[in-house]
């Protein structure tokens, strides 16, 4: 959610705005809800269909290979670097994802399945 400060006399000073939610399907006209204390506000918004159909996710990352298993946490990690973002999506430049360690055979199978994918 986005926070924005609006100073207009005695009006609310900091509104938090949610995402634009289309009224039907996954694009087109919809509403964005804002809250400030006990106040709420709904504004019309639009998710252009040519953004949604080109790529489903707002943020696409290119991932490195999974790192070694960390015995203390039982997880392994890999880093992703931003590859492409929807024009208005405020994506992190890099992200770090973790997953539980599995047995060697499972790991190999998963690695083969995921090969070549971002």
């Amino acid at each position: 959610k986005k926070k924005e400060k609006v100073k207009k006399g005695s009006e609310c000073s900091e509104w938090t705005w949610g995402p634009c939610t289309p009224s039907s399907k996954d694009c087109g006209m919809g509403f964005r809800e804002g809250t400030c204390g006990a106040q709420t506000q709904r504004v019309h918004c639009k998710v252009p269909c040519n953004w949604k159909k080109e790529f489903g996710a707002d943020c696409k990352y290119k991932f490195e290979s999974w790192g070694a298993c960390d015995g203390s946490t039982g997880t392994k990690a890999r880093q992703g670097t931003l590859k492409k973002a929807r024009y208005n999506a405020q994506c992190q430049e890099t992200i770090r994802v973790t997953k539980p360690c599995t047995s060697k055979t499972k790991s190999k199978t998963k690695a083969k399945k995921g090969k070549g994918k971002d």
């Epitope: 986005k2 634009c20 918004c45 252009p48 931003l82």
Partner: antibody, heavy 117, light 107 residues
Framework: QVQLVQSGGGLVKPGHSLRLSCAAS????????MNWVRQAPGKGLEWIGM????????ILNQKFKDKATLSVDIAKNSAYLQMNSLRAEDTAVYYC??????????WGQGTLVTVSS | EIVLTQSPATLSLSPGERATLSCRAS??????LHWYQQKPGQAPRLLIK???QSISGIPARFSGSGPGTDFTLTISSVEPEDFAVYYC?????????FGGGTKLEIK
């Protein structure tokens, strides 16, 4: 930070074509949308279109569909604007800018294209 | 396409005064509105993105409000270096469009 250096402008005769270059240095050229904007002398800003270097997805202002072609060369960290069938009204300063919704944008210095016989 | 109308076309102020620049969209554009400053012979410079989000390196005297159709750029106390042309731009739908600009001049 991204630095954008533009080149390729100059005097061109009506009906001719011109290719403008926008060379990027610094981080992550390929991750961000590259916009092209022009500004006629003494006038406002006009968006031509944009291209994403990662896959060359291009979105063009329909006004320029028969006039402009956008391309990129990731190996050279460069974006290009090809302008065809130039006319006097295409005389303008042309800008490239790299856009990130998270951090904002970076602009080239602009390059002047003068169309005259 | 979405039309952005900026007012006033020219704003004459003295340094130290408060500047209020308006940008009205022909339809709701949520908060997908950005403000630029342009000085003669220079490229535009982004001041505010998404109606009210500040940009690194831009002085705190610049602020913006929205969302919807009516947007405002406020300069709390105008400095001599602020005299320039200001443009709003929408990124809600294609084509991206700019307002006609507001020239902030010294009174």
């Amino acid at each position: 930070q991204v630095q954008l250096v533009q080149s390729g402008g100059g005097l061109v005769k009506p009906g001719h074509s011109l290719r403008l270059s926008c060379a990027a240095s610094g981080q992550s050229f390929s991750s961000y949308w590259m916009n092209w904007v022009r500004q006629a002398p003494g006038k406002g800003l006009e968006w031509i279109g944009m291209i994403h270097p990662s896959d060359s997805e291009t979105i063009l202002n329909q006004k320029f569909k028969d006039k402009a072609t956008l391309s990129v060369d990731i190996a050279k960290n460069s974006a290009y604007l090809q302008m065809n069938s130039l006319r006097a009204e295409d005389t303008a300063v042309y800008y490239c800018s790299s856009w990130s919704a998270k951090r904002g944008d970076f602009w080239g210095q602009g390059t002047l294209v003068t169309v005259s016989s | 396409e979405i039309v952005l109308t900026q007012s006033p076309a020219t704003l004459s102020l003295s340094p130290g005064e408060r500047a209020t620049l308006s940008c009205r969209a022909s339809e709701s554009i949520s908060n997908n509105l950005h403000w630029y400053q342009q000085k003669p012979g220079q490229a535009p410079r982004l001041l505010i993105k998404y109606a009210s989000q500040s940009i690194s390196g831009i002085p705190a005297r610049f602020s913006g409000s929205g969302p919807g159709t009516d947007f405002t750029l406020t300069i709390s106390s105008v400095e001599p270096e602020d005299f320039a042309v200001y443009y709003c731009q929408q990124s809600n739908s294609w084509p991206l469009t700019f307002g006609g600009g507001t020239k902030l001049e010294i009174k």
